[in-house]
Structure formats: C-alpha cells, structure tokens
C-alpha cells in the first residue's frame, strides 16, 4: 500500500531549551521522520514569515540578538503538498535596558498617594530595582513599584531607577519628573504703615506667602471694603475708617490660603 | 550512495601545522553538517568540532578552540580540518562523518591516521 | 557538560547468545521537543563507527532487526538479540540532546567468550 502523504516533520533547537543569552549561537534542525513521495523543498519560517535564503535543513543563527526571539518552523514541501513543524519558542535573554520611570500620577495633589514604576526591557524580568531620587539613591527601596502614599512637597524631583537581572544591570534612564502642587504656604497679612494708624490715613498692607505650587495667581481680601479688588498682592485703604477693625488676605493659585486676620487699631483724629 | 572519504595518513613533524581532508559524495554536500572526530589509539571518540557546509557555520569543543579550524571547499565537496602546532598529543586517527543537523551522525568516513614525529 | 558512562567495559558472549550493553547519561536526554537524541555505534575492528540506531529505538538503514535499542530519561540498552561474528567489535553510545559538546560513552567490547 502506498500512501501519499505530505512531509512529517519535526523541529530540533541546539540548546534544547531554546533559551540562549544574546551573541550565542542557535541552531535548528529539521528532521523529515516520513515523506511520500520525497520531499523537494525546505524552508523556513519565524512568526508566520519566511526567512529569505534559508532553504536547508539546518537553520544557523549566529550571534543572536534580542529581536530574533520568536516562533520558528520549518516548512518542507513535496508533490502532495507542504509540511509544518511544530513552533519552537526561542527565548534570546538579555540584560536590562536603559530604564523609564512612569509615575502615576504627576502633577500629585499634596496629600495624595503616588505610584512610580520602573519600566526596563529585560529577559529574564529583572529582579532587583534600585531607585534614586534628585540623583541620590533611596534606601529599601528594591522593587519594581515605590508606593509614597501621602505626597509631600519635598517629595518632588527627578526620579530615576536602574533595573537588573542575571545577565547584568541596566543603565539609569533619564528619569521623570514628579511635580507636587500644593496650596500657598505661610500666608500672612502685613501692615506697612507705621504705628498707630489714625482715621483718615491711606493704610497699606501686603500678603505675603512662604511657597506655592503652582505659582500664585490671585489674591482675595475680606471683608470686602469698598476699595478697589487688586491683582497684586498689595492693598492700599484711603480714607481708613475707624471701624475698619481686622483684615484678612488669602493667596490664591489652584486653592487658596488664608492668613490670619490683623488688627489696624484704627485711632480717632 | 553516500561516501566519505578520507587519505589513510599522514605523517608530520612537531610544531608544524596538517591540514586533513574529507571529500563527499552521493548526496548534496550543502544539505548536512560535517563532524570531526578524534580516536587515540585504545581509546574512546571524542568530538572535535562540525561545520555546515551551507554556510561555514562552525560549532568547536572548546578543548579544540585554536587547535583545530574547520573549513569546506563546497566547489569540490570537500571538507578541511586544520590541526595547528602539533605535538605527540596530537597523533590519532581522525574521522568526518556526514550529520543530519546536530540530530545524529549517520556515515562516517574511513578516517586519518596522524603521526607527528620528528 | 552530559557525561555518558557505558557498562559494561567488556562483554564476553557465545554466537547466538543475547548480550545487552547499558549506557547511562549524567542529566536527561529528552530534548525540548519530546525526542531522546540517544544513539548507538559499532566500530568494528580496524574500521570507522558505524550508525546502529538512532533516537533511541530507530534502527539506521541497513542494520538488522537482532539489534534494538530502548530506555529513556537517562537510561538507555542496546540489545542484540542473537550475537552473531560480524557484530563484534566496541559499542559507543552518544547523545546530541544537550549540544555542544557531543558527547561518546567510553564503549564497551563485545568479544567471544
């Protein structure tokens, strides 16, 4: 009885566990175990495509880089029709690359939790993590994720990492910038006149505030006198009465701060 | 059908350099690997290096890296084994045999006997 | 690198008896895509090894059916079931799963008792 039927085939991968670290060298052999009739073509394929001027029974991979990991067949061919290989899955594993660091998310709220992740290509996955913030490495800090779950300002700043695996360490990435936005601090209301302050004197008073993030754009006043809103942080009162007793400034950027009230002590003529 | 042959042998002197043959036919020579393997007198197989004559690409032990080159002239079918700076350590009979890939060694030519002597 | 030890060294038999020669291996020698890359040799006296079987269990073209090769993992038989005179001479084992190296058992010679 002969039986026409299209090549059976079977892939062999030196190493065996088609696992090589990159610059080793990968060989694949292509074992027809049966073929009626003979076999007249070979070929082979890596994730579906075929591989130009490949058409022996050995397939040689020197110096292997990391964008030649994939699935690999062979395809052999006779009067009947093509036959497949199963797919061999070749691992080339290297150390890590250049790191990013993804943050989630910047700009933070102070007072809001934040998620720093450290992103390096790698195979097999890296295993350690170190981090470092404004260029300075961050103790006990070894993984992957750095969880900060209440934000401070001082916790703004470059971030950077470096990821390793067992093939080497990676170089640190340009790192990510972390922005803390947080309402004006410190703000006070000033007087600017000198003491005491009698009826009928142009008062002058300023709000001042320590820091803010982002900058401060407006100003607020209270009570609201019959004066004119000013933009900048300086108010000037004409004409002071006495019963124009305490004044309160707030510096505003996306929130605003509000300093204690001040008391003119406004004297009679 | 398939035949590998290799001279019967050669003798050398120390420090100088042999470089073996082993020609091929009844088959197509770019199709399978070429082994070469060496035999002291008495004693076991112990595999030197193979070559694809597709595309010259070698594999060596590494107990022969700098000793032994391997080449092929695929024009002729012939496979070339380089032994450099021989001693006495050297002298054996050296075998090449046709490949399936790195799956099994199927035809195993007659094989060189090396002497290195002075 | 796979160390492969045979046993025994010699092994003397009467034509027409069974002999049967074991070759171990240092790790496994199933390959990644199920297959044992195991084989067997004869070198007969003055002359170049010979393919017996390959892949364990698969006699070469040419060889006769007395020869049979079986085991797995990391023990593995050669038996030849009537010994005949043609078949004396060193049996080496080898293995190509975990290449390079390959690598040759030390082999084992068959003579007449």
């Known amino acids: 009885l002969n039986v026409k039927h299209t090549p059976k085939l079977e892939i062999k991968v030196t190493p065996s566990d088609a696992i090589v670290r990159e610059g080793d060298s990968v060989t694949m052999t292509c074992e027809v175990s049966s073929s009626n009739p003979e076999y007249t073509t070979v070929s082979w394929l890596k994730d579906g495509t075929s591989l130009k001027k490949q058409n022996t029974f050995t397939l040689n991979l020197r110096e292997v880089t990391k964008d030649q990991s994939g699935k690999y067949c062979c395809q052999v061919s006779n009067d009947v029709g093509p036959g497949r290989s199963e797919e061999v899955f070749l691992q080339v594993q290297y150390a890590p690359e250049p790191s990013t660091v993804q943050i989630l998310h910047s700009p933070a709220v102070e007072g809001s939790q934040v998620e720093f992740l450290c992103m390096s290509l790698a195979n097999p996955l890296p295993t350690n993590y170190t981090w470092y913030h404004n260029g300075k490495e961050m103790q006990g800090r070894t993984e992957e994720k750095v969880h900060i779950p209440k934000i401070l300002p001082w916790h703004a700043g470059t971030y950077s990492c470096v990821a390793e695996n067992i093939l080497g360490t990676g170089q640190r990435g340009p790192g990510a910038e972390l922005d803390v936005q947080y309402p004006p601090k410190k703000v006070t209301t000033v007087i600017q006149n000198p003491m005491p302050i009698r009826e009928g004197d142009t008062v002058t008073l300023s709000c001042n505030y320590n820091s803010s993030n982002p900058s401060v754009t407006r100003y607020e006043w209270k009570p609201h006198g019959a004066w004119e809103e000013p933009s900048l942080g300086v108010l000037k009162i004409q004409n002071v009465g006495w019963d124009n007793t305490t004044i309160a400034c707030a510096a505003c950027n996306s929130w605003c701060s509000w300093a204690s009230p001040v008391a003119l002590n406004v004297q009679y003529a | 059908q398939v035949q590998v042959q290799q001279p019967g042998a050669e003798l050398v002197r120390p420090g100088t350099s042999v470089k073996l043959s082993c020609k091929a036919s009844?088959?197509?020579?770019?199709?399978?690997?070429m082994y070469w393997v060496k035999q002291r007198p008495g004693q076991g197989l112990e595999w030197i290096g193979v070559?694809?004559?597709?595309?010259?690409?070698?594999y060596y032990n590494q107990k022969f890296k700098g000793k032994a080159t391997l080449t092929v002239d695929t024009s002729s079918s012939t496979a070339y084994m380089q032994l450099s700076s021989l001693t006495s350590e050297d002298s054996a009979v050296y075998y090449c045999?046709?490949?399936?890939?790195?799956?099994?060694?199927?035809?195993w030519g007659q094989g060189t006997t090396l002497t290195v002597s002075s | 690198d796979v160390v492969m030890t045979q046993t025994p060294l010699s092994l003397p038999v009467s034509l027409g008896d069974q002999a049967s020669i074991s070759c171990r291996s240092s790790?496994?020698?199933?390959?990644?895509?199920?297959?044992?890359?195991l084989h067997w040799y004869l070198q007969k006296p003055g002359q170049s090894p010979k393919l017996l079987i390959y892949?364990?269990?698969n006699r070469f073209s040419g060889v006769p059916d007395r020869f049979s090769g079986s085991g797995s993992g990391t023990d593995f038989t050669l038996k030849i079931s009537r010994v005949e005179a043609e078949d004396l001479g060193v049996y080496f084992c080898?293995?190509?799963?975990?290449?390079?190296?390959?690598?040759f058992g030390g082999g084992t010679k068959l003579e007449i008792k």
């Open positions: 080898s293995q190509s799963t975990h290449v390079p190296p390959w690598t």
């Open positions: 070559i694809d004559p597709s595309d010259n690409f070698t």
């Open positions: 892949k364990v269990s």
């Open positions: 045999a046709r490949g399936y890939g790195s799956s099994y060694v199927g035809y």
């Open positions: 009844g088959y197509t020579f770019t199709r399978y690997w």
């Open positions: 790790q496994s020698l199933v390959h990644s895509n199920g297959n044992t890359y």
